[in-house]
């Protein structure tokens, strides 16, 4: 058992051009919080699979209000660590997802509004009990800097938190079958809960419920002495039951090396020679190789034949990240020409073209719509020597016949919230704005200071339109 700890150092714009807009504004202050999700790294899990190792949510950070005109700085962070307790052994290799969430604090309908700002993911090797590991991850134009570690909860110790330690009962040495807890030489490994009845003097276990015998003893509970031929190479205390020297436990007894590692004694302890793909004091930590399938979402793994050489994931279209764990915002590449609206549908990219343009990427300039009526309130206008349909909001296509999800085109300006109705849509304006689509600031130089329905100002018509 133990705790995975995550410390967020900073969240802000990454280096290079295209700095992101501040997620908060004078009109709409907000605060950040973080979510971490951990999964055992060797399981072939999709990015959407449950957080099998655990998850945690941070506290809310301080309220942040953007200073107009200033570039987006590193944003104020919540205090404290994110802690994810784990009950069983630490797997050594794990995958993580860290999400940065924004909580808007304006006058929201139905309480605060939450939205996901950034998500980073990765797969790492980490031994429990080690120092803090630092990391930097980027999500779009944002950059997240953080540190993490796994630590065992007493009495567990070791790189996987599977060994148990207790203070020594005797000052000189540990009890039978128990090794010193390096590096805590003043503590001893504590016995696991072995099979009921397992001899505390002559039996031990590496897994709960088993009973393995020290040399010179046998039987299901290690209570039966073997023949005195075991006294031929004496080393250890005298046994009262056999009248000869029963060999005491050597450091390699019971083979402490996991995962097929071979044990050799050293003057002070033991050393494990690990098979390929494993490392650690007892070969308990697995290295990530292509054989482990580290690439999500159908990514192709190249290289990484052994744990010490890096693997590279070649991601399929639509995914990116060192493990193909991030979905590409393909619209950020602005593939739609001539002012077309980009829609990333997941399985495909779609451009909703402005009036007068067509084609998969709105690349075709339609010559003429003369002689055609523009449907749904669209108007035929001159433009560049040709007639085109200029469509009303919510409609598109050559003749304005294509009906869109009324909220898909973000029809509410200045942070207004769109609600689709059977009759069309409604814009709920942020404080200090009004109009059918919240397009009019009431006081342009102080919009945030006004209530949602400022005194002395009323719309002439209901704010519901097709």
């Amino acid at each position: 058992a133990g705790v995975f700890e995550l410390q967020i150092h900073s969240f802000g714009p990454g280096p290079g051009p295209g700095a992101p807009r501040s997620p908060c504004s004078a009109r709409l202050p907000c605060r950040l919080f973080f979510r971490v999700c951990l999964k055992p790294g060797l399981s072939e899990e999709a990015a959407e699979s449950p957080c099998a190792l655990g998850a945690a949510l941070s506290a809310r950070g301080p309220v942040y209000t953007e200073q107009p005109g200033a570039p987006a700085p590193d944003l104020p962070l919540p205090d404290g660590l994110l802690q994810v307790p784990f009950r069983d052994a630490w797997p050594g290799t794990f995958s993580f997802i860290i999400e940065t969430w924004r909580e808007e604090l304006g006058d929201q309908i139905g309480g605060p509004a939450w939205s996901l700002l950034a998500r980073v993911a990765g797969r790492r090797r980490l031994a429990a009990g080690g120092p803090w590991a630092r990391d930097i991850q980027r999500a779009g134009a944002w950059e997240l800097r953080f540190s993490y570690r796994a630590r065992c909860e007493p009495p567990a110790v070791g790189t996987a938190c599977t060994r148990l330690c207790r203070p020594r009962s005797a000052p000189s040495r540990c009890g039978p079958g128990l090794r010193p807890c390096a590096p805590l030489e003043d503590e001893c490994e504590a016995p696991l809960v072995c099979r009921a009845g397992c001899s505390p003097e002559h039996g031990f276990c590496e897994q709960p419920g088993e009973c393995r015998c020290l040399e010179g003893w046998t039987g299901p509970l290690c209570t039966v002495p073997v023949s005195t031929s075991s006294c031929l190479s004496p080393r250890g205390p005298s046994s009262a039951t056999t009248g000869c020297l029963v060999p005491g436990p050597g450091p390699c007894d019971g083979n402490p090396c996991a995962n097929g590692g071979s044990c050799s004694e050293t003057p002070r302890s033991f050393e494990c020679t690990c098979p390929r793909g494993f490392y650690g004091l007892r070969c308990e930590v697995s290295g990530v190789t292509c054989a482990d399938g580290p690439c999500f979402n159908g990514g192709l793994c190249v290289g990484g034949a052994d744990p010490d050489s890096a693997y590279i994931c070649h991601c399929p279209p639509g995914f990116q990240g060192s493990n193909c764990e991030k979905r590409v915002d393909r619209c950020s590449l602005q593939p739609c020409r001539n002012g077309g609206l980009c829609l990333d549908l997941g399985h495909a990219l779609r451009c909703r073209c402005r009036a007068g343009f067509a084609g998969p990427r709105c690349e075709h300039d339609l010559d003429d719509c003369a002689g055609r009526a523009c449907a749904n309130g669209g108007t035929c206008v001159e433009g560049g020597g040709a007639h085109r349909c200029s469509c009303a909001l919510g409609f598109g296509g050559r003749d304005c016949r294509e009906r869109a999800d009324p909220c898909a085109a973000r029809p509410c300006a200045h942070g207004g919230r769109c609600y689709a109705h059977f009759s069309g849509l409604v814009c709920a304006c942020a404080p200090g704005y009004m109009g059918a689509r919240c397009e009019f600031p009431v006081h342009p130089d102080g919009a945030s200071a006004l209530p949602a329905a400022p005194p002395g100002l009323r719309p002439g018509d209901p704010q519901r339109y097709l």
């Epitope: 002012g339 108007t379 009303a392 109009g435 059918a436 689509r437 009019f440 018509d461």
Partner: nanobody, 117 residues
């Protein structure tokens, strides 16, 4: 980008009338929401009247019944007809356009209206 040019400001006596015009350089004024704002000396700029892309109109309580906003899509223009003018209507009047094409607000340079006897 949208360029806005106001005209029609000037000196007028209390009770008089004036019409402000704003011409927008834009391929289709139907994709603009248009408004008039004013800023009196030492005061915040405030919305006087607005007309959405769909024709719905908005007025400040202080001008209701006296001012009328209208648009002429063929001429890419918006107008503010001001009747029964009062001294407190003295201000610089600004034309405003919100472009639904690029989701940006645009402002004119302003035209001064002075109501004085």
């Amino acid at each position: 980008e949208v360029q806005l040019v106001e005209s029609g400001g000037g000196l007028v006596q209390p009770g008089g009338s004036l019409t402000l015009s704003c011409a927008a350089s834009h391929s289709s004024v139907t994709s603009l929401s248009l408004a008039w704002y004013r800023q009196a000396p030492g005061k915040k700029r405030e919305l006087v009247a607005g007309i959405s892309y769909d024709g719905s109109k908005y007025y400040a309580e202080s001008v209701k019944g006296r001012f009328t906003i209208s648009r002429d899509n063929a001429k890419n223009s918006v107008y503010l007809q001001m009747n029964s003018l009062r001294a407190e209507d003295t201000a610089v009047y600004y034309c405003y356009a919100y472009s639904w094409t690029d989701r940006l607000p645009y402002w004119g340079q302003g035209t001064l209206v002075t109501v004085s006897s």
